[in-house]
Interface confidence: low
Amino acid sequence: AIVFIKQPSSQDALQGRRALLRCEVEAPGLVHVYWLLDGAPVQDTERRFTQGSSLSFAAVDRLQDSGTFQCVARDDVTGEEARSANASFNIKWIEAGPVVLKHPASEAEIQPQTQVTLRCHIDGHPRPTYQWFRDGTPLSDGQSNNTVSSKERNLTLRPAGPEHSGLYSCCAHNAFGQACSSQNFTLSIADESFARVVLAPQDVIVARNEEAMFHCQFSAQPPPNLQWLFEDETPITNRSRPPHLRRATVFANGSLLLTQVRPRNAGVYRCIGQGQRGPPVILEATLHLAEIEDMPLFEPRVFTAGSEERVTCLPPKGLPEPSVWWEHAGVRLPTHGRVYQKGHELVLASIAESDAGVYTCHAANLAGQRRQDVNITVATVPTWLKKPQDSQLEEGKPGYLHCLTQATPKPTVVWYRNQMLISEDSRFEVFKNGTLRINNVEVYDGTWYRCVSSTPAGSIEAQARVQVLEKLKFTPPPQPQQCMEFDKEATVPCSATGREKPTIKWERADGSSLPEWVTDNAGTLHFARVTRDDAGNYTCIASNGPQGQIRAHVQLTVAVFITFKVEPERTTVYQGHTALLQCEAQGDPKPLIQWKGKDRILDPTKLGPRMHIFQNGSLVIHDVAPEDSGRYTCIAGNSCNIKHTEAPLYVVDKPVPEESEGPGSPPPYKMIQT
């Protein structure tokens, strides 16, 4: 048997909100479950659909979901069918509607002292409670000769008089929520003695020193009073005008004229009509002074031929809002075509070179006119005046590669060397016309160069190969003065390069030939055993066919290299005693001795009374102090070489002998006894 485990139950529901009717069955076989609404099958929609065997409502609809729902379970095999209990929704809703005139039949029939009934067309379930309003103020029962039933949707005014005139609206609420009238009713019951508006003043905008006119008229029986007020409630009459409204005139028909308007005249003007009965009728209008600000500057624009471009003109702030138009060559642009104005924009469709020039955006209102120019350039692809050419540049001299192009705007030129961008430095310079200057050409400048000339419209490029014509030169140039150690083997190298490999030979400066123990081996001068006679001036000559010859002069000195006869030793001295650091060197030419103490050269002329350097090179320091401690370096040098040796100097306090030590105890370190 088919058993309902969960049956749908009648329930409260809210219009437009979710709901669920549950249905669950248990059966021995496969059961097919569907739903009926008032006996008709329920079709699934996005709003109402089966969910499992339950019926789900995404948004309850008071019209489509009213009725009786029933869950039906059917065993398709046995044909057995079971139906659930009926379930329905108590749908809570509220719907706004207008306020309408129920009595009399038409507005034309409304007369003073007649009964007027208004009906509030807000419906809902449960039945709503109503509240009426006149001009936004709630009305309560029995208020000012009207009968209002808050439970009813009707408002009865009996009798209706001019004091009941106003905008009537209603609101209603129930368990679902609240709604207010979608359209309100204006009740107008004329009272001849009430002031009625015939002509209301309008806001005006005027230029400085111009005139402004406000019109204002009321009607009533007897005729009403009319009065003008400005801003601070100051009355304006032809007899008494406030100081800042000396040029104001009130005409018999109620119009107010202001002449030669000034900024202080701007503001709110109130026209007040007062009838014999009824409240005063206040009408307001504002006088604005026209104004216009300056326009922002345009940046020059560069466009490419064939493209579509737009230039927006931001209108200046102004009152009234300024009108904007574009001009070119003194002619206002049309609103269609290839070059035209659209709104505040200048539109150039399919730009041509002839479109280049100055375009002007104009803005104007009552306060005046402003204009701003924009310069439009139509870019062209560069063309060649002179391409870079393969060049032979001489080493050591300046070299030039040309890249001369023309275009609009003036093209920018960049150069590449071996695909690397050349940045200007001390050796490379790009002139304004695109020419590249290489200052002091070097051998490795021989490579590929490429120039690229560009504008926004496109670019062109060309490349050239540079061959460097190498100059005849010594590589490296021989040192002009060199020393050779007496009685030792020595070599003096000389090498050179040029466009062709040069030949190199040595000769003595006096023209005499080289001794047999001296050989010239491919530019290297070789001394097997240096003698005193080998000293002198020598010349290295490098030559080739196309470039001739070059010479380098070298003065060779024969010397006995420096050796130390006496070197300074590690020395410890008592504070206040004298330190002696000995140093003696020998060599030819005779070496000079210099001392360096604590990382600075000791200048013999600035040593002061405590220090002295002897002829033999020894350094003596009298009355030593702890700050004299440190490393001392003896430097021996002559025109051929230099040598140095160093030793530390320690300055210590003299120890006080203890009782256990006899007077003959040796000092704990090697001392100089002075």
């Epitope: 979710r18 709901a19 549950r22 499992g52 065997s53």
Partner: antibody
């Protein structure tokens, strides 16, 4: 008679793992979504996650507090749901219940009318 | 996540008293709310489903109402066997969330 029986609880150290089982009988397990709910001592109920039926691709969903650490699975041939708990923390100490709607695999319309007796998991060093 | 705020957290009333528990959702959940009763050492048991429907076999003194965000659970006449903790639970959206619970005691 419908029955849900949890097992596998016990004492585990922080950072450790534990796997709970939930054996079901007395209803169509394969068509039902299975949920896990826990309750720390003296505290309220906290939903951990659920696994839907095979017809709903065994889709799983977890509470943010356990996502990435806990995994729910099922074996319809054994009528059993599982809760694999890794990287356990002391705040995971609680009684763990498996629960089911019983008749529908549709979880959003679920209320839990079948509950197990619960199994205690203690995470402590 | 939808937060469920249940109050009071505990109450003490006499037998026969009317007891009211409220539950507030942090966003609109329509009527997708259930109420459970849990006795010490036992698993929870559903009393009310879909905010206002009484589960089969549950005494009629238990009732529920509300829709949207504000819900009320009422025991019209408290009985000694009603002691325990009551929880609301939303299932409008995952993760499913429970209220903090209300412990009901007899004076």
């Amino acid at each position: 008679e419908v029955q849900l029986v949890e097992s596998g609880g016990g004492l585990v150290q922080p950072g450790g793992s534990l796997k709970l089982s939930c054996a079901a009988s007395g209803f169509t397990f394969s068509g039902s979504a299975m949920h896990w709910v826990r309750q720390a001592s003296g505290k309220g109920l906290e939903w951990i996650g659920r696994i839907r039926s095979k017809a709903n691709n065994d889709a799983t969903s977890y509470d943010a507090s356990v996502k990435g650490r806990f995994t729910i699975s099922r074996n319809d041939s054994k009528n059993t749901a599982y809760l694999q708990m890794n990287s356990l923390k002391t705040e995971d100490t609680a009684v763990y219940y498996c629960t089911s709607r019983g008749y529908s695999g549709y979880d959003y319309s679920s209320y839990f009318d079948y509950w197990g007796q619960g199994t205690l998991v203690t995470v402590s060093s | 996540d939808i937060q469920m705020t249940q109050s009071p957290s505990s109450l003490s009333a006499s037998v026969g008293d009317r007891v009211t528990i409220t539950c507030q959702a942090s966003q609109d959940i329509s009527n997708y709310l259930n109420w459970y009763q849990q006795k010490p050492g036992k698993a929870p048991k559903v009393l009310i489903y879909d905010a206002s429907n009484l589960e089969k076999g549950v005494p009629s003194r238990f009732s529920g109402s509300g829709s949207g965000t504000d819900f009320t659970f009422t025991i019209s006449s408290l009985q000694p066997e009603d002691i325990g903790t009551y929880y609301c639970q939303q299932y409008d959206n995952l993760p499913i969330t429970f209220g903090g619970g209300t412990k009901v005691e007899i004076k």
